[in-house]
């Protein structure tokens, strides 16, 4: 197909001469927005320690999530870390381990 107003739709990239829109390859690469990318973006591969929540399509990247008992911090998004098994002495658990947060502990009321 031809670009619309100079850009290509999600799931495509633009040709070098700017005259054509070329489909991304399902499961290999993707584009999420109207664009003038010369190459679609490479699909993410889930690491060991992660589960694939949804596969890569031509318009959406793979969605990976940390396995049960581990979480990904915003500060270090490149790896899943083990959740703590319990709270330190003098603290109580108020939040469970989730794929995006460690257990939450607060000080016991004295």
């Amino acid at each position: 197909s031809s670009p619309s107003e100079g850009l290509c739709p999600p799931g495509h990239h633009i040709s070098e001469d700017g005259r054509d829109c070329i489909s991304c390859k399902y499961g290999q690469d993707y584009s999420t927005h109207w664009n003038d990318l010369l190459f679609c973006l490479r699909c993410t591969r889930c690491d060991s320690g992660e589960v694939e929540l949804s596969p890569c399509t031509t318009t959406r990247n793979t969605v990976c999530q940390c396995e049960e008992g581990t979480f990904r911090e915003e500060d270090s998004p490149e790896m899943c870390r083990k959740c703590r098994t319990g709270c330190p002495r003098g603290m109580v658990k108020v939040g469970d381990c989730t794929p995006w947060s460690d257990i939450e502990c607060v000080h016991k009321e004295s």
Partner: antibody
């Protein structure tokens, strides 16, 4: 001669908003994909937004997505950048730029307008 | 994002000399690289696109080369008006720029 003239820059407090304009002449504005590119005080260049020739489609890097909106008025040969929730790291010279024919990159830039975000 | 690295922040040369400014991409970008010249107090001007194609009106003293991850802008017979910052840019995946190389004339 291709001419791109930016305006609207100024001093804004963090969290504030501002709208930049770019007046185009010397070419058929409505036929060209346009972008905004900024240059930090340290001279680093960063692409900020792109809009299709007719104005129907836009795209942005994650750093400004949801805060900046690019638009155009082809009847007035003018490109706009609406900026909100401004941060100190948005301080830069803002250039409007044209995507060239069959080169898929910027061929002409305006002279720029300066945005300073500071309390 | 693709990172473009210009390892030399400054380069010094003399009028009449030949100088090569290099740029490295963090992944293969084919030949989707442009070079811009920015003179003091001015906006960037396109010199080279598709790694080696000279833009309209650019003197043939400016030559671009490279593909994949390694790119070079060569200025032969350097003139005093070539005093400027030079930036590489990849446009295969969105657009990212190198940090720039300032060319100083001795």
């Amino acid at each position: 001669e291709v001419m791109l003239v930016e305006s609207g820059g100024g001093l804004v407090k963090p969290g504030g908003s501002l709208k930049l304009s770019c007046a185009a002449s010397g070419f058929t504005f409505s036929s060209y994909v346009m972008s905004w590119v900024r240059q930090t005080p340290e001279k680093r260049l960063e692409w900020v937004a792109t809009i299709s020739s007719g104005g129907s489609y836009t795209y942005y890097p994650d750093s400004v997505k949801g805060r900046f909106t690019i638009s155009r008025d082809n009847a007035k040969n003018t490109l706009y950048l609406q900026m909100s929730s401004l941060r100190s790291e948005d301080t830069a010279m803002y250039y409007c730029a044209r995507r060239g024919d069959s080169m898929i990159t910027t061929d002409y830039w305006g002279q720029g307008t300066t945005l300073t975000v500071s309390s | 994002d693709i990172v473009m690295t210009q390892s030399h922040k400054f380069m010094s040369t003399s009028v009449g000399d030949r100088v090569s400014i290099t740029c490295k991409a963090s992944q293969d970008v084919g030949t989707a690289v442009a070079w811009y010249q920015q003179k003091p107090g001015q906006s960037p001007k396109l010199l080279i696109y598709w790694a080696s194609t000279r833009h309209t009106g650019v003197p043939d003293r400016f030559t671009g080369s490279g593909s994949g991850t390694d790119f070079t802008l060569t200025i032969s017979n350097v003139q005093s008006e070539d005093l400027a910052d030079y930036f590489c840019q990849q446009y295969s995946s969105y657009r990212t720029f190198g940090g720039g190389t300032k060319l100083e004339i001795k």
